[in-house]
Interface confidence: low
């Protein structure tokens, strides 16, 4: 809305007007003049600045000007005031009209002004404090110099006895809940009362009503009552003008994450409305606007420090649990066990949820994204994670069928990367999909749209449908290089496995046994020689390597990686009835990364000189980088059910120190 307005005077009348600081008033003196008038003069209070504008040229008028101006259609007045009035109608402008002859005015028009200051303020400079009347507050820009306020989706549950997230209702039960909201201050300054016929209104658009909620603390002195004033069915709220210098504090919560058809931007407006007459709508004479961007949901890559590790307790995974516990004890984080009453026999905790976070300058907290998979762990995120300063979000398809690709072993994120000069300081999301044109499985559109809409971790689609389970964590992971900001991409490689096995065969270890010491499997006595002589297995793994290479090329291109950034971990797959791949031996790339400590599926590879040659090989690749390898036996509790260590664990990590609003997507 233009920051200026026209006030119509009428000769023989006194007009009351409210002047909002920063909004010049234009007065058409010509239309207000009596027919006989030819010239006019002006008088005005000291606190009013008046300019006569003729044909675009402005001339300032002295306080009690004797000067007369010729009346013409192109002559208008421009009024400005520098400070708020202390009393209503205490400032005035008088226009005297003259005919051709006389010196005395033939008529007069009076404008009685009440100057008030109205400013709807937010933390537009993103320093965690609401500043006063930031000129950039109505727009939103990215980058380190960017301006515009930020809003969190209030998706945690600060009141434990409530069934859902805080943003699911229009109530505030605690001050803790308010801390998740962004502050907005309506500052007013002026006389004790306004002239009759004015009303101040806060409002939002219909399209924003399901995306933002606004609360007001009614009684900050005695026991507080939090009133929901905007959002959902409430599109506007009349604000009582209190007089003097006043600051009304509002709390704003996000209700929806950015998504398809919603950029994440919402605006809140305050208007001063003027009453004309019965049956005539109020008209806005001033509008101030603030714009918020709803903070995106951000995923955390392996390079970030862990806070807690989650794992399910099953009837058959006691030893696995013990090994994970030992690994976690080495790191500075806690182990959280999801017991059977909660997991109800579902061990795949990686597939049920993805940990991320949201952040604003004043606050941030972890948020779990619940997958549409909804296995027997489906109650876990809401019952065990959702809580004070721990948010929850989900996306469920309405018409699409949920497939294995909708599990979150198929949702990963890279460390920060630079691609052809473009930086992704929060990394890029990686999801598995089907081969172009193959008509195979694909992650459901609602989740893909959600991830895309967050903007800060531009997703990359990989090809994972060649796998039985079809998850990206079956062929890739990232590891940090301790003490640096660098990382390595680890990729499963059948070529690397064949190369290693051939080397061992050449060295005379062709009869080295895989799966040694494991009941059922070792009875088949699988040796290096047997693996290498199995033509169909070799052919299958050549095909699987092509699939891996297809992904390798995508990752190099989309993450700006070179061959030096990639480490190949030996892997073998075998084809199932549906011509898709499942791991032949525990798939080492499906590991858990906890700082420098890696929990790697124990591959039970060929025993060469009392040691597993796969373990030795992997240690040789990773330990020189400063990483510590712990091989975890998951074969009976996970591998045989088509998953490994990563699939059976989940890690809540610390957020990035980098602020998402400093980037330019």
């Amino acid at each position: 809305m233009p920051r200026e307005r026209t006030v119509r005077l009428q000769y023989g009348s006194r007009v009351e007007a409210v002047y909002v600081l920063g909004t010049p008033l234009w007065i058409d003196v010509y239309s207000a003049a009596p027919a006989e008038a030819r010239t006019f003069s002006l008088k005005h209070s000291e606190r009013v600045r008046v300019e006569v504008v003729r044909d675009g040229e402005a001339e300032e008028v002295a306080t009690n000007g004797k000067q007369r101006w010729l009346l013409s259609p192109s002559t208008t007045l421009r009024l400005t005031m520098g400070q708020a009035s202390t009393e209503a109608s205490s400032d005035k402008v008088t226009v005297n009209y003259y005919d051709e002859e006389g010196n005395a005015p033939i008529d007069q028009a009076g404008l009685f002004l009440t100057a008030i200051e109205i400013s709807l303020d937010v933390d537009a400079d993103r320093d965690g404090v609401v500043e006063k009347n930031n000129p950039q507050k109505a727009s939103w820009t990215w980058g380190p110099e960017g301006q515009g306020a930020i809003l969190l989706v209030n998706c945690d549950r600060d009141t434990p006895w409530l069934p859902k997230e805080d943003c699911s209702d229009e109530k505030v039960y605690s001050k803790e809940d308010l801390k998740d909201m962004s502050q907005m201050i309506l500052r007013t300054k002026g006389p004790d009362r306004l002239p009759a016929g004015y009303e101040m209104v806060l409002y939002i658009s219909v399209s924003d009503s399901d995306k933002v909620g606004v609360f007001y603390v009614e009684n900050p002195f005695f026991g507080q009552r939090y009133i929901h004033i905007l959002g959902r069915r409430k599109l506007y709220h009349v604000v009582k003008y209190t007089g003097g210098s006043a600051e009304l504090l509002f709390f704003v919560e996000g209700l929806r994450f950015p998504d398809e058809g919603f950029s994440g931007l919402v605006s809140i407006h305050v208007s001063l409305l003027e009453y004309m007459a019965e049956e005539v709508p109020l008209t806005p004479i001033f509008t101030d606007t603030v714009t918020f961007r709803i903070a995106p949901w951000i995923m955390t890559p392996n390079i970030l420090p862990p806070v807690s590790v989650f794992v399910c307790c099953m009837k058959d995974n006691y030893l696995f649990l013990k090994e994970v516990k030992n690994l976690v004890e080495k790191t500075n984080c806690e182990l959280k066990v999801c017991f059977q009453y909660m997991n109800r026999g579902d061990r795949w905790i990686q597939d049920e949820i993805e940990f991320g976070y949201i952040e604003a300058p004043h606050k941030g907290f972890p948020v779990v994204l619940d997958s549409p998979r909804d296995g027997n762990l489906k109650d876990f995120p809401i019952k065990q994670l959702l809580g004070p300063d721990f948010g929850y979000v989900t996306r469920e398809p309405v018409f699409e069928t949920v497939t294995s690709l909708d599990s979150f072993g198929n949702l990963e994120v890279s460390p920060p990367v630079t691609v052809n000069g473009k930086t992704y300081p929060l990394g890029r999301i990686l999801i598995g999909s089907s081969f172009p044109l193959s008509g195979g499985r694909r992650m459901t559109k609602v989740v893909r749209d959600f991830l895309q809409a967050q903007q800060v971790q531009a997703p990359v689609e990989l090809y994972s449908d060649w796998l039985t389970v079809g998850h990206v964590d079956e062929f890739m992971t990232f590891v940090p290089i301790p003490g640096t900001t660098q990382f390595r991409l680890l990729m499963a490689s059948t070529a690397a496995c064949y190369k290693l096995f051939r080397e061992k065969q050449k060295e005379g270890h062709g009869e080295a046994i895989l799966f040694k010491g494991l009941g059922g499997m070792s009875s088949k006595r699988i040796t290096i020689n047997k693996v290498l002589s199995n033509e169909s297995l070799a052919q299958e793994n050549q095909y699987f390597q092509r699939c891996l290479d297809w992904n390798r090329d995508i990752l190099k291109k989309e993450l700006g990686l070179t061959e030096q950034d990639i480490i190949d971990l030996p892997a073998l797959f075998k084809m199932d009835e549906g011509r898709q791949a499942r791991a032949f031996f525990p798939n080492m790339v499906n590991m858990i990364v906890l700082n420098k400590d890696l929990g790697i599926p124990k591959p039970f590879g060929p025993q060469v000189e009392e040691e597993c040659c796969l373990e030795t090989h992997v240690r040789g690749l990773l330990e020189p980088l400063g990483l510590a390898c712990t091989f975890i036996d998951d074969i009976s509790a996970y591998h045989k059910f088509l998953g490994e260590v990563h699939c059976g664990t989940n890690v809540h990590r610390k957020p990035f120190t980098f602020k998402w609003w400093h980037m330019v997507p």
Partner: antibody, heavy 121, light 105 residues
Framework: QVQLQQPGAELVRPGASVKLSCKAS????????MNWVKQRPGQGLEWIGM????????YYNQMFKDKATLTVDKSSSTAYMQLSRLTSEDSAVYYC??????????????WGQGTSVTVSS | QIVLTQSPAILSASLGEEITLTCSAN?????MHWYQQKSGTSPKLLIY???NLASGVPSRFSGSGSGTFYSLTLSSVEAEDAADYYC????????FGGGTKLEIK
């Protein structure tokens, strides 16, 4: 159901201090202000002060500003009032009372049974 | 602070009689709450926000008033109504009236 439990009686020497307790149950302790009210034998009610258990923000009747100190222990859902430098004037029944801003227009909807404090040597 | 004066200090009533207890303020109060205190027990909320009955309170009790004058009416006194009645305002700092003792003849 909502209950505010207070000990029945306290006998205190003049000049000493006493810390009265009020254990809340049956509701979310941190969601309601806790008030303390004094009633001398055969007399009316006097508001002493109140505390918000969620953050210990408190307000006092000026007459009790130097006499009473209100605190809470959230972990045990207990409100406390310490009375210091006791004199015979402080002999009274002291009630804790929950204040409901939502359902009862700011009235005190639940009261403890009261603790009778006797100041005597 | 607002001073509340209750009258009468003592009221003796017969069973079935209608009675009115009054509470006047030395300056305008937003609204009034009323409490009943039976001998040896803690006060119990009777009426809140001038005219609203607290839960479980018999409908023979009613409240009214505004500004500086408020009243509590019992339409038909019963034996169990013998008690002290206190008015209470929460404008500025909270205060209570001195109380009215209701005795049954």
């Amino acid at each position: 159901q909502v209950q505010l439990q207070q000990p029945g009686a306290e006998l205190v020497r003049p000049g000493a201090s006493v810390k009265l307790s009020c254990k809340a149950s049956g509701y979310t302790f941190t969601s309601y202000w806790m008030n303390w009210v004094k009633q001398r034998p055969g007399q009316g009610l006097e508001w002493i002060g109140m505390i918000d258990p969620s953050d210990s923000e408190s307000y006092y009747n000026q007459m009790f500003k130097d006499k009473a100190t209100l605190t809470v222990d959230k972990s045990s859902s207990t409100a406390y009032m310490q009375l210091s430098r006791l004199t015979s004037e402080d002999s009274a029944v002291y009630y804790c009372a929950r204040k409901d801003y939502y359902a009862y227009g700011g009235a005190m909807d639940y009261w403890g049974q009261g603790t009778s404090v006797t100041v005597s040597s | 602070q607002i001073v509340l004066t209750q009258s009468p200090a003592i009221l003796s009533a017969s069973l079935g009689e209608e009675i009115t207890l009054t509470c006047s303020a030395n300056s305008s109060a937003r609204y009034m709450h009323w409490y009943q205190q039976k001998s040896g027990t803690s006060p119990k909320l009777l009426i809140y926000s001038t005219s609203n009955l607290a839960s479980g309170v018999p409908s023979r009790f009613s409240g009214s008033g505004s500004g500086t004058f408020y009243s509590l009416t019992l339409s038909s006194v019963e034996a169990e109504d013998a008690a002290d009645y206190y008015c209470h305002q929460w404008s500025g700092y909270p205060t209570f009236g001195g109380g009215t003792k209701l005795e049954i003849k």
